[in-house]
Every structure is written in C-alpha cells, then in structure tokens.
C-alpha cells in the first residue's frame, strides 16, 4: 500500500485546513491508527492528534477544540484531519504516520501554508502646490504573508519607489508615488492597487489629488471701449481667475474709494448709469490660501458732449 497526501496545503488565515492522509492499501489491509505531528518543531515532533480505529480521535491539549475529523461518511482508510481556524503559527511541516496491519507503518509529510491577506492603508503626502519640484503625493503600505504586491493606477505622470520590511512571519511593502504638482492634476484619482494570493480580487484605495494653485487674474468688460459712455446702464467688470482652493475676490479703486452706487458681487463690479465720476483705475484682488494676484484696469467714461478722444489702458500685475 501507499499513502496519498498533498505536498502543500494552502489556506487563508482563519479558514479551516484539511490535512489529507489516505492509505491506499491492498485488499484485506486495515488502518489501526493515524498519528499527526508537527514535524518542524524545534524540540522534536509535537503530536497534534491520534486517530484510533477503535477509540476515536485523540487531540493534543495544545490543539484542543481545533482538530476534528472530516464530516461523515468516513472511509476507515482515511486519516485526514481538519485543523480549524488556521493561524500564522500553524504554518509549517506536518507528518502523518499510519499504522496498518498487516503491512506495517507508513509516513508522509506535507507543508501547511497560511496566507495572511493584507489590510492596505494609503497616506497622502504633504499639501501639493503648483511650482513645487518632485513631491510625495501618497504612500501605500500593505503587510501580509507572503509579501503583497503594491502598484499604482493613475493617469497622472509620476514616479514610484518601493521598499519592503521582512518580519518573522510576514512582510510589509510600502510604495511611494512622487510627482511634480500641476493644476491639471487637480481632482485626478491616484489609486493604490494591492495584489495578494489570499485576496479574491485586488484591493484598491483611491486618493483624489488636490493641487493648490492660483491662475493669473484678468478683467473683462472693457473689450468694446465705445460702450463706456455717460448714461450707459448695466456696465460691469468681471474678474477672471481660477484656483484651488477656490479664490475670493475683492475690488478697490486705486485713485480713491469706490464711487457710490457701484456694487461688488464677488468677482463682478456692477456700475449704476455711468457718469464721468466712474472714470478711474480699478483693481481686482484675487486670493486663496496658496497665493494672491492683482489685475488693474483704467476706465475712461466718454462724455459725448466733449470732443476729446477717449482712451482705455489695460494693465495686469501680479
């Protein structure tokens, strides 16, 4: 006769492991008992259990409640046992020793491999600001057994670097994603992808990039200078910029206070019916937590009763 077993049995942490040991004997042969032992114990073989043909399953106190026979129906030549709720410490070599009559004893070894799936974590780097050089966007760490694979899925251009730390029964892998921040990256997803044989599918953690920036400011509304004449209604100036975080707007007049009746509504400066008193230099001040910008325009309100020509200058400063 001969023993049938597996070279390697692989289970995920917390699952039950079936340790197979089947005696394929000749006609008339019987199994008296099957002894299971840890074969890699430093102080020699440590008995797990003994399956006796007459007196049943004997379990080592160290494995009390964790070693069982497979559910019925059972073949008297089957010495397989179930190891409940596998933990990392169970990983190692096991020996099955089958005592038969009249053929004698047979033994076989198998390796139990316990997969520990990772629980990945993603940590964003420091605040990203346009104008910075190569900067850490995020790091992703996953620990498991065996070592997990950590990669990145993103449309953003960047560089990755990985390092691994080995522990006694597992390994931690950390991958960093570096980039040169630009406003086009704002709102883009950066996804950490963790692969591991103990996972049914890859684990993904997504981080949305936030890059602080503030665009140059400009003022619209003076494109047709002929419209800025005494008596015109609905004249307005609009300050244009964009930023992250979204900027706030403030309007001032360089050569004095804002004329009465002029309304400030965020990025828009609204005028009452125009008079020559509305002529002057207006400044739009745009700011967010990252930076600030100014843009100024000169308004000349034309009085048709005057023959003098009109002139409008646009100046932008930051």
């Amino acid at each position: 006769g001969e023993l049938e077993t597996s070279d390697v049995v692989t289970v995920v942490l917390g699952q039950d492991a079936k340790l197979p040991c089947f005696y394929r004997g000749d006609s008339g042969e019987q199994v008296g008992q099957v002894a299971w032992a840890r074969a890699d114990a430093g102080e020699g073989a440590q008995e797990l259990a003994l399956l006796h043909s007459k007196y049943g399953l004997h379990v080592s106190p160290a494995y009390e409640g964790r070693v069982e026979q497979p559910p019925p129906p059972r073949n008297p030549l089957d010495g397989s046992v179930l190891l409940r709720n596998a933990v990392q410490a169970d990983e190692g070599e096991y020996e099955c020793r089958v005592s038969t009559f009249p053929a004698g004893s047979f033994q076989a070894r198998l390796r139990l491999r316990v997969l520990v799936p990772p629980l990945p974590s993603l940590n964003p780097g420091p605040a990203l600001e346009e104008g910075q050089g190569l900067t850490l966007a995020a790091s992703c760490t996953a620990e498991g057994s065996p070592a997990p694979s950590v990669t990145w899925d993103t449309e953003v251009k960047g560089t990755t670097s990985s390092r691994s730390f080995k522990h006694s029964r597992s390994a931690a892998v950390t991958s960093e994603f570096h980039l040169v921040p630009s406003r086009s990256m704002n709102g883009q997803p950066l996804t950490c992808v963790v692969s591991h044989p103990g996972l049914l599918q890859d684990q993904r953690i997504t981080h949305i990039l936030h890059v602080s920036f503030l665009a140059e400011a400009s003022v619209r509304g003076l494109e047709d200078q002929n419209l800025w004449h005494v008596g015109r209604e609905g004249a307005m100036l609009k300050c244009l910029s964009e930023g992250q975080p979204p900027p706030s707007y403030n309007w001032t007049r360089l050569d004095g206070p804002l004329p009465s009746g002029v309304r400030v509504d965020g990025d828009t400066l609204g005028f009452p019916p125009l008079t020559t008193e509305h002529s002057g230099i207006y400044v739009c001040h745009v700011s967010n937590e990252f930076s600030s910008r100014d843009s100024q325009v000169t308004v000349d309100v034309l009085d048709p009763q005057e023959d003098s020509g009109k002139q409008v200058d646009l100046v932008s400063a930051s």
Epitope: A37, H58, V59
Partner: nanobody
C-alpha cells in the same frame, strides 16, 4: 509484560474531587495508549478517557469539562483528575494499556473504587 497499579479511589461528596493514579511497570515502551475505564454495578464497562504517548487525549461526552487525563512520562504514571463529581460517577475505575500494534486495550489493572454520595 506491563503491570498496572491504580490508587486514589475513595468516598467523596457530590461536587467534590478525586485524583486517580496508575503506575505502569515492565515493558512500558510497548505502550501505545493508556486509558481509564469504569464499571458501575449491573452496567457494561465503559472507556472514560485515554491518552496517547504524545499526550493527545480523548474523553467520553459525559465527563468532558470535568475530568482531565494526563501523564508523567518520567514516572511512568497516568492520572485522572475528577472534578465536580456526581453520584452517577460511582463505579470501579480501571487503568488500561494498549500495546503497540494490538489496537485494543489488552493490559488491565485491578481497579479502584470511587463512590460519590449525595
């Protein structure tokens, strides 16, 4: 030839404890299993607990959580610690040994009486 000698029996009140000992001598290296049987008057002898050379144990359902079988290889002795005893545990307790390859308990002690009063 293996010889088995039990001790530790006696009279105890319900809820009390006793510790039985079984000292083995002779060809002890031939022993595969050792166990404790009991036989109450008018009843069949039943296996209560057994222990392997490697220390793995088996218990009959009625004593699980109350009885503990253990062994001291240096002293060639097997023990049965009996806690939370009940009147139904009253019986003669026998130590038994199974020789390697026999697959049945084939060596017996003389027995020790355990009486649990209510």
């Amino acid at each position: 030839e293996v010889q088995l000698v039990e001790s530790g029996g006696g009279l105890v009140q319900a809820g009390g404890s006793l510790r039985l000992s079984c000292a083995a001598s002779g060809s002890i290296f031939d022993i595969n299993l050792m166990g404790w049987y009991r036989q109450a008057p008018g009843k069949l002898r039943e296996l209560v607990a057994s222990i392997t050379r490697g220390g793995s144990t088996w218990y009959v359902d009625s004593v699980k959580g109350r009885f503990i079988i253990s062994r001291d290889s240096a002293k060639n002795t097997v023990y049965l610690q009996m806690n939370s005893l009940k009147p139904g545990d009253t019986a003669v307790y026998y130590c038994a040994a199974e020789s390697i390859g026999s697959y049945t308990f084939d060596r017996w002690g003389q027995g020790t009486q355990v009486t649990v009063s209510s």
